[in-house]
């Protein structure tokens, strides 16, 4: 048993069938000796006297808040949440597997630009008695700061019969360089309660491994006299780190009929202009990627052809 | 994806197209020595991240682009010191900060140069013979050293008398060649803005 | 005394359909995960399925991944598992099984799948 | 489709000391527990080992189990002719959790 903050503890429990549990001392936080009694939840019934009880916790029936009182006057209380152990894998109940980029994967982070700042989602089905608390630091054995906001519902979406919620955090490395070779990963926690059950959901990552630039801004055409060629040209997001020289970009131009089957054309360059064709009721779309370490590409950024 | 080839013009700042080529052939190597050595502990998630030029040159600091240096987490100590005759330096860019930075990378490079060399020829002596140094980056590392050309004090090539213990000998190639992918990175970056500049 | 009972197994032609059910006792039986586990004759342990608690995941072997169905009703504590399509391969004694460090096994049912 | 390797067969006379090994990779024995099971003709396989070296109430201490790396083993001390079964490992794989996976299985035989 530990705690997870005042009053809150959680018990860890090997989740099999008629398995023993575990005894839990619980004790009254008071200065009185005698006449104190406990209950459950919103029991009245009692379920012992005296300035400690001793529980045996197997099954969620036996977690919940436990007060202690005095003549009808509560004394303290101590809220007790399961930790299921199955088979040596602590439970993953309460978020769902993302499955990308690999499975397993339960928080999802991605960062705009090198700045230190990133943000993670998760996703649930679960709609109520739900909280979240998130933690993050820059390596574990001499962990440096990352301040984490609060999670907030950030969508919500239909997915066949059930509804699925999107939880979101954005956190920020306290100290950071944007040009820094990073050697520590950024590790995020994400502590989760569903009524009386604890979880927890960790993910370990590098900044650089997690940038997903903005689309390219200011993305026009520019016919060509006496040519089906347009010069498409766009610049560098906002979000983007500065200076761009020495955070480069890569683009990708690709030109896409109305129909998704039709051919598309692709053309990558380091500039920020392309001469392509531009065909009838096609589009334009340029996305851009870190020109020098492989992470995420952009989404894309599109204009019609017309 | 295979970086874009920059052919560079004449004018160009001429450390740039070897960076370009430097980066790619590591690239190359890194994939290659993930899949190769699939049973081995290779990937990022897996590995220690160790940079062998540690304490020994600050390319970060001293190659910072001047946007930067307002920034101070980005300002550690700079108290390396270097020699400063690079052939990059085309001589109205010459500063002193910029050859301190072009001199970092020499050392780097050189660091680099020494350790790979010396994997290799332990991994020569592997009856698996189950993956060696990719020539065509250790050729690129030797172009951007001499493109750089400073005048260094040559470092012996370490040799080692006992027996190589070749699953060891795998998973510090893997570390290496993280830790030198991430430095290439840096160089590139550098040699774009200093060709900018 | 936690007790897992298995029916549902015989012979049935390629091509056709099985229900196996596991009646569970003993044990809360909403609250664990449960796997089907099955055995061809003369062969080694081979995993089939697995069910969340509460029914809301499912998992399967790639071998009945389309054909085979896993599910539980926690009101009536028992498992199910659906076979459609069956083939000569899937000849086998098939067990139910609780997920956890301690597991309890069913008496196992015999499918044989021949024309 | 077997990702753990056991030898198919193992023999001792009674009381000698016999070891099967389960042989898997990094991303199952490596990151996961292992179980042992003890199979006998015509009946469900039995815990005998959890968490790589836990026996379960009920089973004799001859049996005990131990992993390392991305090896595991099961050790019968002091073998007797009950003892004479198919053995399974079993653990996980971090990116199919929960499937299980079985070893290949080992006939132990007791030998005079």
């Known amino acids: 048993i530990w705690e997870l903050k005042k009053d809150v503890y959680v018990v860890e429990l090997d989740w099999y069938p008629d398995a023993p549990g575990e005894m839990v001392v619980l004790t009254c936080d008071t200065p009185e000796e005698d006449g104190i009694t406990w209950t459950l939840d919103q029991s009245s019934e009692v379920l012992g006297s005296g300035k400690t009880l001793t529980i045996q916790v197997k099954e969620f029936g036996d977690a919940g808040q436990y007060t202690c009182h005095k003549g009808g006057e509560v004394l303290s209380h101590s809220l007790l949440l399961l930790h299921k152990k199955e088979d040596g894998i602590w439970s993953t109940d309460i978020l769902k597997d993302q499955k990308e980029p690999k499975n397993k994967t339960f928080l999802r982070c991605e960062a705009k630009n090198y700045s230190g700042r990133f943000t993670c989602w998760w996703l649930t089905t679960i709609s109520t008695d739900l909280t979240f608390s998130v933690k993050s630091s820059r390596g574990s054995s001499d962990p440096q700061g990352v301040t984490c906001g609060a999670a907030t519902l950030s969508a919500e979406r239909v997915r066949g019969d059930n509804k699925e919620y999107e939880y979101s955090v954005e956190c920020q490395e306290d100290s950071a360089c944007p040009a820094a070779e990073e050697s520590l990963p950024i590790e995020v926690m994400v502590d989760a309660v569903h009524k009386l059950k604890y979880e927890n959901y960790t993910s370990s990552f590098f900044i650089r491994d997690i940038i997903k630039p903005d689309p390219p801004k200011n993305l026009q055409l520019k016919p060509l006299k006496n040519s089906r060629q347009v010069e498409v040209s766009w610049e560098y997001p906002d979000t983007w780190s500065t200076p761009h020289s020495y955070f480069s970009l890569t683009f990708c131009v690709q030109v896409q009929g109305k129909s998704k089957r039709e051919k598309k054309d692709r053309v990558f360059t380091d500039k920020t202009s392309a001469t392509v064709i531009c065909r009838k009721n096609a589009s334009i779309s340029v996305r851009a990627q870190d020109r020098y370490y492989s992470s995420s590409w952009s989404e894309w950024a599109s204009v019609p052809c017309s | 994806r295979n970086l874009p080839v920059a052919t560079p013009d004449p004018g160009m700042f001429p450390c740039l197209h070897h960076s370009q080529n430097l980066l790619r052939a590591v690239s190359n190597m890194l994939q290659k020595a993930r899949q190769t050595l699939e049973f081995y502990p290779c990937t990022s998630e897996e590995i220690d991240h160790e940079d062998i030029t540690k304490d020994k040159t600050s390319t970060v600091e001293a190659c910072l682009p001047l946007e930067l240096t307002k920034n101070e987490s980005c300002l550690n100590s700079r108290e390396t010191s270097f020699i400063t005759n690079g052939s990059c330096l085309a001589s109205r860019k010459t500063s002193f900060m910029m050859a301190l930075c072009l001199s970092s990378i020499y050392e780097d490079l050189k660091m680099y140069q020494v350790e790979f060399k010396t994997m290799n020829a332990k991994l020569l002596m592997d009856p698996k013979r189950q993956i060696f140094l990719d020539q065509n980056m250790l050729a690129v590392i030797d172009e951007l050293m001499q493109a750089l050309n400073f005048n260094s004090e040559t470092v012996p090539q370490k040799s080692s008398l006992e027996e190589p213990d070749f699953y060891k000998t795998k998973i510090k190639l893997c570390i290496l060649l993280h830790a030198f992918r991430i430095r290439a990175v840096t160089i590139d970056r550098v040699m774009s803005y200093l060709n900018a500049s | 005394q936690v007790q897992l009972v298995q029916s549902g197994g015989g012979v049935v032609q390629p091509g056709r359909s099985l229900r196996l059910s596991c009646a569970a006792s003993?044990?809360?039986?909403?609250?664990?995960?449960m796997h089907w586990v099955r055995q061809a004759p003369g062969k080694g342990l081979e995993w089939v399925a697995f069910?969340?608690?509460?029914?809301?995941?499912?998992y399967y072997a790639d071998s009945v991944k389309g054909r085979f169905t896993i599910s539980r009703d926690n009101s009536k504590n028992t498992l199910y598992l659906q076979m459609k399509s069956l083939r000569a391969e899937d000849t086998a004694v098939y067990y139910c099984?609780?997920?956890?460090?301690?597991?309890?096994w069913g008496q196992g049912t015999m499918v044989t799948v021949s024309s | 489709s077997y990702v753990l390797t056991q030898p198919p067969s193992v023999s001792g006379t009674p009381g000698q000391r016999v070891t099967i090994s389960c042989s898997g990779g990094?991303?199952?024995?490596?990151?996961?527990?292992v179980k042992w099971y003890q199979q006998l003709p015509g009946t469900a396989p039995k815990l005998l080992i959890y968490?790589?070296?836990q026996r379960p109430s009920g089973v004799p201490d001859r049996f005990s189990g131990s992993k390392s790396g991305t090896s595991a083993s099961l050790a019968i001390t002091g073998v007797q002719a009950e003892d004479e079964a198919d053995y399974y490992c079993?653990?996980?794989?971090?990116?199919?959790?929960?499937?299980?996976?079985f070893g290949t299985g080992t006939k132990v035989t007791v030998l005079g």
């Open positions: 069910i969340r608690y509460d029914g809301s995941n499912k």
């Open positions: 099984k609780t997920h956890g460090s301690h597991d309890n």
């Open positions: 990094r991303s199952n024995i490596g990151s996961n527990v």
């Open positions: 079993q653990s996980y794989d971090r990116g199919t959790h929960p499937a299980l996976l």
């Open positions: 003993g044990f809360t039986f909403s609250s664990y995960g």
């Open positions: 968490g790589n070296d």
